[in-house]
Interface confidence: low
């Protein structure tokens, strides 16, 4: 091989010990736990005339593996057993007959950390490329799902919330989505990397958390995002009043039935006569309640559950103060990772006992 052809390989640090056999691959690759990576790889080997028509088999081995004894982590040889731990996750994606040794890793696991070397076999021509080796580093999963809310949430009106993990790869095991919500919900359609939750918020869902949890079962790792439903009182119907509750500041909204009717959606005609007066009462009581409740984490969960798969309960964060009948409610900074969603309430009639019970909806 001319020296000029070898220079770029030397520069890349990719020259194997035998100049007739060389391999070019990045020496280090980092992948987050549960995710995937495709490592481009090219190799070269001399082809004696007697091996010209032999099939080319490629193998990736973990460093220290003994060829005669240990199975590879990936190969294109169909009858070759591979390591149980990497089966289906490590693939020799490149075509060795075209000098391509590219390796695909999906559902990366912590124990995939380590170095790997490539071996080729073509008839009697066999060679293990011990240098360079590919070093795989598996790091913490830092990506988190996105929750998309189209427009404003209004009580009694169903909206589709989408939880997506667009950063996940297509080739990996499809993730398992779990939703945790106090509001009445049902599951909508899902794609490989997104799940839709149909939410029908009620007035008492103000200040409650909605969490989308995504589990990458192939690696046994979970990530989640929580948003907070932030209630604002925007009366649009002059005949609709707001019942203020007892002003105790207790956050004990019962949300027993997830697929049930929206509690307190109807209001009596009598309240309409006292609309302005009630607005002032609401203002006063909500201020008082907010001062008492913000920062508390009390829960009084009820046993009546209503989600198809009600498994998990979560503590309720305190509601935020509402300063006027029509103004937007300021949000309380509970967690820098907490995101807020707005609910516009045309009318409300919360129960005095307001302990919120959360339901989990799981989609697979």
């Amino acid at each position: 091989m001319p020296l000029l052809l070898l220079l770029p390989l030397l520069w890349a640090g990719a020259l194997a010990m035998d100049p007739n056999f060389w391999l070019q691959v990045q020496e280090s690759v980092t992948v987050q736990e549960g995710l995937c990576v495709l490592v481009p790889c090219t190799f070269f080997h001399p082809i004696p005339y007697y091996d010209k028509n032999s099939p080319v088999h490629g193998y990736w081995f973990r460093e220290g593996a003994i060829i005669s004894r240990d199975s590879p982590v990936a190969t294109n040889k169909l009858d070759q057993e591979v390591q149980e731990e990497t089966q289906g996750r490590f693939r020799l994606l490149g075509d060795p007959s075209r000098n391509n040794c590219s390796l695909s890793i999906v559902d990366a696991r912590r124990r995939d950390n380590g170095s790997y070397f490539f071996r080729m076999e073509r008839g009697s021509t066999k060679y293990s490329y011990k240098s360079p080796q590919l070093s795989v580093h598996v790091t913490d999963l830092t990506h988190r799902p996105k929750i998309l809310i189209p427009g404003t949430l209004e009580p009694g009106h169903s909206k589709n919330l989408t939880c997506s993990v667009s950063w996940a790869c297509e080739q990996g095991t499809p993730p398992i989505f779990s939703w945790l919500s106090a509001a009445p919900t049902s599951l909508g359609p899902r794609t490989t990397h997104s799940s839709v939750l149909i939410i029908t918020p009620r007035p008492q869902d103000h200040g409650t958390n909605l969490t989308c949890q995504v589990k990458f079962a192939g690696a046994g790792v979970t990530t989640e995002r929580t948003i907070q439903l932030n209630v604002t009182y925007v009366p649009q119907n002059p005949t609709t009043g707001i019942f203020p509750g007892d002003g105790s500041g207790k956050q004990e909204t019962r949300a027993g039935v997830v697929h049930g009717a929206i509690g307190g959606a109807g209001v009596t005609a009598l309240l309409a006569l006292c609309l302005c007066l009630i607005f002032f009462i609401v203002k006063t009581h909500r201020r008082k309640a907010a001062r008492t409740a913000v920062g508390r984490n009390d829960t009084h969960p009820t046993t009546g559950s209503a989600s198809p798969k009600h498994q998990k309960k979560s503590k309720l964060h305190g509601p935020t103060e509402t300063s006027s009948c029509s103004g937007a409610a300021p949000t309380v900074e509970m967690d820098e990772e907490l995101h807020y969603a707005s609910l516009n309430f045309h009318g409300m009639n919360p129960s005095k006992d307001t302990s919120t019970e959360y339901s989990e909806v799981r989609t697979q």
Epitope: R62, G64, Q83
Partner: antibody
Amino acid sequence: EVQLLESGGGLVQPGGSLRLSCAASGFTFSSYAMSWVRQAPGKGLEWVSAISGSGGSTYYADSVKGRFTISRDNSKNTLYLQMNSLRAEDTAVYYCAKSRYYYGDYFDYWGQGTLVTVSS
Amino acid sequence: EIVLTQSPATLSLSPGERATLSCRASQSVSSYLAWYQQKPGQAPRLLIYDASNRATGIPARFSGSGSGTDFTLTISSLEPEDFAVYYCQQYYFWPLTFGGGTKVEIK
């Protein structure tokens, strides 16, 4: 500093059972294969069993297959050897040894050994 | 299984002398052979791996050579602490096997 400390040896009657432990420190335990190697009094070394770093693969010498079980608890950095149906010929010092690489190869670190005596 | 035969069984030499220990495999083990040193009452200690590579902290007077079926451990000039039993081990095939050992004793 890599350290391997065996325990659990002792005197046991033929047909009896014993469980050896090997506490490891000074290296990332889960990344390396581990083995048990024994040495009968005044004799040479005999490899007994090996286990891969994750515990997913195990290997045994024919002389102990079906009687001994190797296992590991990576959360405790501990290697185990459960020995059942013990015979007089199992009498030996049992060493816990760390493989240099992920799968069983040569051994770069050894424990000090624990003596197992099988006698009636 | 691969049988490793070490010779001689005992080697009587004086400090400063050269020691040559042999290990022969019943079939080729390529270069997948290691050498260990064991002193009475102690655990074995790795000297050489992959037939010719010295392990960390092993003095340069120890060297290994050979491939296939014939291997040699050479101690260029014996020090008093080198008198011990030496074992070879192959890791090319399961089961892993050791040679019977060569005892290097003071003459």
